[in-house]
């Protein structure tokens, strides 16, 4: 007789999840020799230990501490790029500007990027059928708690000028409920961070509005200023040209506004 299984509202664990995480770990440590001290088997065992046999609505940051310890990584604290609702462009940027880092350029972010996972209470099984949805089921699910934990640590590590890429095509360019708005903004350390510089990415080719005047950007400025961190904002009117100019800064067309 098959056991009754909780049906959650979200998609189930990504297929071949253990092998995918391990494959990413092995590849990451090959590309980044400074992380060769990492044992990918231990990383997987710690990752698994954070959610296996636990109720998927009762996961805590504490559950992920063994994994956080194993994945400890030093990135240049003044080269951090945060992003909100514009992941692909942020990643394209750091692929070109190799001295800057998004969370997904770190080992732990790279391991989990775009994956879903959860277990079941009191069984060692991974649930490939369904996992809790943050809104419909519970916020303390394995995926949400993981990203909250690593995002908090990433923001805490930042110093000097921190950049954030924001999506100017969204109704809320700055969203207080995003990971950036609810976690990262509040964990920047005022004693280390001098300025948060927002890059607002325009969507339409003919969009010449100053989106730095958007009410949600003003709200972000207010939150940041209250935390004794300076705020600056730039419009990126042409993201395609922006990337091109990062690749080829000497290009004559790159002196004008992008």
């Amino acid at each position: 007789v098959p056991r009754w299984r909780q049906q959650w509202s979200g998609p189930g664990t990504t297929k071949r999840f253990p092998e995918t995480v391990l494959a990413r770990c092995v590849k990451y440590t090959e590309i980044h020799p400074e992380m060769r001290h990492v044992d990918c088997q231990s990383v997987w065992d710690a990752f698994k230990g954070a959610f296996i046999s636990k109720h998927p609505c009762n996961i805590t940051e504490e559950d992920y501490q063994p994994l956080m310890k194993l994945g400890t990584q030093t990135v240049p604290c003044n080269k951090i790029l945060l992003w909100s609702r514009i992941k692909d462009l942020a990643h394209q940027f750091t692929q070109v500007q190799r001295d800057m880092f998004t969370l997904e350029d770190t080992l732990l972010g790279y391991l989990a990027d775009d994956l879903t996972w959860c277990g079941e209470f009191n069984t060692s099984k991974i649930n490939y059928q369904s996992c809790p949805d943050w809104r419909k089921d519970c916020s303390n699910n394995p995926v949400s708690v993981f990203w909250k934990t690593v995002s908090r640590r990433f923001a805490e590590a930042a110093c000097d000028v921190v950049h954030v890429m924001l999506n100017g095509s969204r109704s809320k360019i700055f969203d207080k409920n995003s990971t950036f708005g609810s976690v990262e903004v509040h964990n920047l350390q005022p004693e280390k961070v001098q300025t948060l510089e927002a890059w607002v990415i325009h969507g339409g080719r003919e969009d010449s509005r100053d989106l730095c005047q958007d009410p949600t950007i003003k709200e972000l400025e207010s939150i940041i200023s209250k935390r004794n961190i300076q705020f600056s904002c730039k419009n990126i009117y042409r993201p395609d040209k922006f990337l091109q100019c990062v690749k080829n800064p000497e290009d004559s067309s790159c002196t004008s506004e992008i």
């Epitope: 092998e19 391990l22 092995v26 088997q41």
Partner: nanobody
């Protein structure tokens, strides 16, 4: 208990080939990342290569890339290292281990000696 038994080493001329094997027992082989590590005379242990449980990803130290190939047969609980175009610098005692590339060096076999010399 965990047992790892390496074999396949020997004396070979520069440019030659060898295939090392590691027979594993005492644990669920198909669940584990596996690696090859080597120790040259008078030197510390050096990581050589790593493979994931399902074999979908492999990694190599720079000096062996394009020459060595790690593989595994989970049905036979065996790890392999195909070594081509061998160089004198590859002379070492070769061990397989659970995990990798880094981490604690817990479980070891006796190793298999590879000597590259003309």
């Amino acid at each position: 208990q965990v047992q790892l038994v390496e074999s396949g080493g020997g004396l070979v001329q520069p440019g030659g080939s060898l295939r090392l094997s590691c027979a594993a027992s005492g644990f669920i082989f198909s669940d584990k990342v596996m690696s090859w590590v080597r120790q040259a005379p008078g030197k510390g242990r050096e990581w050589v290569s790593t493979i994931t449980p399902g074999g979908t990803a492999t990694s190599y130290t720079e000096s062996v890339k394009g020459r060595f190939t790690i593989s595994r047969d989970n049905a036979k609980n065996t790890l392999y290292l195909q070594m081509n175009n061998l160089k004198p610098d590859d002379t070492a005692l070769y061990y397989c281990r659970i995990g990798g590339p880094g981490g604690r060096y817990d479980n070891w076999g006796q190793g298999t000696q590879v000597t590259v010399s003309s």
